[in-house]
Amino acid sequence: DTHKSEVAHRFKDLGEEHFKGLVLVAFSQYLQQCPFEEHVKLVNEVTEFAKTCVADESAENCDKSLHTLFGDKLCTVATLRETYGEMADCCAKQEPERNECFLQHKDDNPNLPPLVRPEVDVMCTAFHDNEATFLKKYLYEVARRHPYFYAPELLFFAARYKAAFAECCQAADKAACLLPKLDELRDEGKASSAKQRLKCASLQKFGDRAFKAWAVARLSQKFPKAEFAEVSKLVTDLTKVHTECCHGDLLECADDRADLAKYMCENQDSISSKLKECCDKPLLEKSHCLAEVENDEMPADLPSLAADYVESKDVCKNYAEAKDVFLGMFLYEYARRHPDYSVMLLLRLAKAYEATLEKCCAAADPHECYAKVFDEFQPLVEEPQNLVKQNCELFEQLGEYKFQNALLVRYTKKVPQVSTPTLVEVSRNLGKVGAKCCKLPEAKRMPCAEDYLSVVLNRLCVLHEKTPVSEKVTKCCTESLVNRRPCFSALELDEAYVPKAFNAETFTFHADMCTLSEKEKQVKKQTALVELVKHKPKATKEQLKGVMDNFAAFVEKCCKADDKEACFAEEGPKFVAASQAALA
C-alpha cells in the first residue's frame, strides 16, 4: 500500500497533534543535547512542510522518505559538530546509512542534569500560561533522557501528565493531588523505558527471531484460548511495530500500533475474553490497556504436551519439515499452559527442546534419544523457582534497603570493575524486585521476578556496552539473551581483581548529607558501600554491615549536632580510621 507522499500519509493517519508529538520525540531522541527551542523550531518546519504535502502530494520533496526528510532537517542544526562531535559525520552519509549512524549515536546515559521538580504553584502557572509548550517540554525532557522510550506510549504518558495538571491545578490542595500522580508517572515511565530498552536490545543485538520467540511466549501466556495462527499473526504485527520504534521510525510505529489495536478489538472473540474493557477506550489508552491486559483463563482440559512433542513417532519429521514453525508451536503450547513460568524460562525450555531434537533426530534411534526430554526440563524450572524463593525470603528478612545492600555487595564482588554509579543503580533496581514481586501469589512470582530482573540486567548490559570494563559482563550480556540472568547469578567472586587503593576523599562527608532526602541518603551510603567492597573485596558481609551501621550512626550524630560541618570534619576521619581497622 504505497503512497505518493509518505509524510502526507502519516500526517493524515495520525492527525496533527500526534504527528507533531512523535516528530518532537524522534528529534529529541536523536539530538539529546539540543535545546528545547531548537527542536520546537525543527518540528514546526517539518509540520508546515507536511501540510503542504497533504494539500498536494506531488509538491516538491513530498515524495522523499521520512528518513531523508528528518535526517536532512537534523543535519541543518548549526552546532552539530561542536555539540555532538563525530555524530556530525553521519550527515555526510546517504540513507539508509545516515539513519543507522544516528541510531548508533543514541546515548543511553546522556550527560544531562537530573530533572528538578519546581514548586506546584510554579508548575500550575506554567501549565495554565501555555499548556501546549508545557506538554511539549515534557515530551522533550523524557525523550532526550530515554532515547528508546516507546514513542506512542510516551504520548499516552503525556496525556496522563496533562490530565493530572488539569485536575490538580483546580484542587484545594494542589500538592496533595498532584505530587502522588507525578511520582506514579515518573516510576511507571522509568519502568516503561527499561522494558522497551530490552525489546530494542533483543531486536538489535539478537535479531527478530529472538524477539518473535519472546513475543510468542508472552502472547501465548496472555491469550491461551487463541489459536497458534492467531498468536503468530499478532507476533508478526507486534514485531513490525517494535522494529519500527527501535529503528527510529516513530510515525510508522505509532500508525501500525493503532492498526494492531484496531485489529485486536475487531477480533476479540478469537483472541481473549479480557480485551473488552480496553476496546471501549480512546486510542492511546486502548493501546496501553491492550499491552498490559491480564492473562486470559486457560482453556479447560488442554491435553498433555507429551503426545505431540515426545511420544509421537513423527516428531523428527515434523521438526525437519518446518523447524521454526514446529518450535514456535511447541513454545505456544508450553507457554499457554504455564502462566506461572517466566518468559525467559519458557524460552530456555524451547532452546533445550531444540538442542535435544538437533541431537536426537540425527541419532540411530531418535525416539529413544528424546524420550526423556521433559525430564531434562526439571532443573531448568527449579533454578528460577529456587532463586525467587531464596530472594523473597531474604527480602522478607531484611527489608528493601538492606536487601539492596546485600545485592550491592554480591554484584560488586562479582564485577568490581563496573563503575560505582552503575553498580548502585542496577543493584537498587534489582532490590526492588522484592517489593514488586514477593507479595504476589506463588503462581505469579516467577514471571514477575525473573522477567523484571531481565529488564534490569539489560540496563547493566547497555551501560556496560558504552564503556566496557569487564570481560565477564560482556560474556553474560552477549552470549545468550535468555541465559543472561543465570549467567550473572553464576558469576563467582573475581579472584583476579586488584583491590582499589584507599582514597580518603571517597569517604569524606559533609553537612549537606543532612538535607538530602531519604532516597538520596541511601544512595550516598550505598555508594560508600560499593567503594568499600572495591577496596576490600574479601571483607565479610558481617564486617561490612558493622561499618555501615557505624556510618549510619556517625551521620545521624553529626546531623543532630549544632555545628554539623565541624562534626563531620572531626568525626569523619575517626569513622574512616575505625572502618579501616575493622576491615584490616
Epitope: N386, E393, Q397, E492, E542
Partner: nanobody, 122 residues
Framework: QVQLVESGGGLVQAGGSLRLSCAAS????????MGWFRQAPGKERVFVAT???????YYADSVKGRFTISRDHAKNTVYLQMNNLKPEDTAVYYC????????????????WGQGTQVTVSS
C-alpha cells in the same frame, strides 16, 4: 571468632548412609543461611544443599531425593543426612554459613568449616 566444626564423616559402602553435623559458634546463627559444599579430589568446590533462616531447603540436582538438610536453631547446628550414597559422593564436605546466604556459589558464603572427609567405596 566464628567457628564451624564438622563431624560425622567417614568411610561407608555404596548404598549406605552417613549423617554429618556442623556446630557453629562465635555468634548467633539463627538468621543465617547454612549449608554444605563438597570438593572431590582435583575438582572445584560445588554446592550440595542449603537451608535458609526460615528452614527452606535447596539441593543440588545430584543429591536430590537422597540427602536431607536440617537445622536446630537452638543448638546453632546444621545436619546433612546422606542416604543411598554413591562412589561419586566421595569428597571433603564443608559446612558454610552466611548472614544473607543468597546464591549457590562458594563465594556467596562468608564462613567455612575445615571440612570432613566422606569416602564411599564400591
Amino acid at each position: 571468632q566464628v567457628q564451624l566444626v564438622e563431624s560425622g564423616g567417614g568411610l561407608v559402602q555404596a548404598g549406605g548412609s552417613l549423617r554429618l553435623s556442623c556446630a557453629a559458634s562465635g555468634r548467633t546463627f539463627s538468621n543465617d543461611a547454612m549449608g554444605w559444599f563438597r570438593q572431590a579430589p582435583g575438582k572445584e568446590r560445588v554446592f550440595v544443599a542449603t537451608i535458609s533462616w526460615k528452614s527452606s531447603t535447596y539441593y543440588a540436582d545430584s543429591v536430590k531425593g537422597r540427602f536431607t538438610i536440617s537445622r536446630d536453631h537452638a543448638k546453632n547446628t546444621v545436619y546433612l543426612q546422606m542416604n543411598n550414597l554413591k562412589p561419586e559422593d566421595t569428597a571433603v564436605y564443608y559446612c558454610v554459613a552466611d548472614p544473607y546466604g543468597l546464591g549457590f556459589n562458594p563465594s556467596d558464603y562468608d564462613y567455612w568449616g575445615q571440612g570432613t572427609q566422606v569416602t564411599v567405596s564400591s
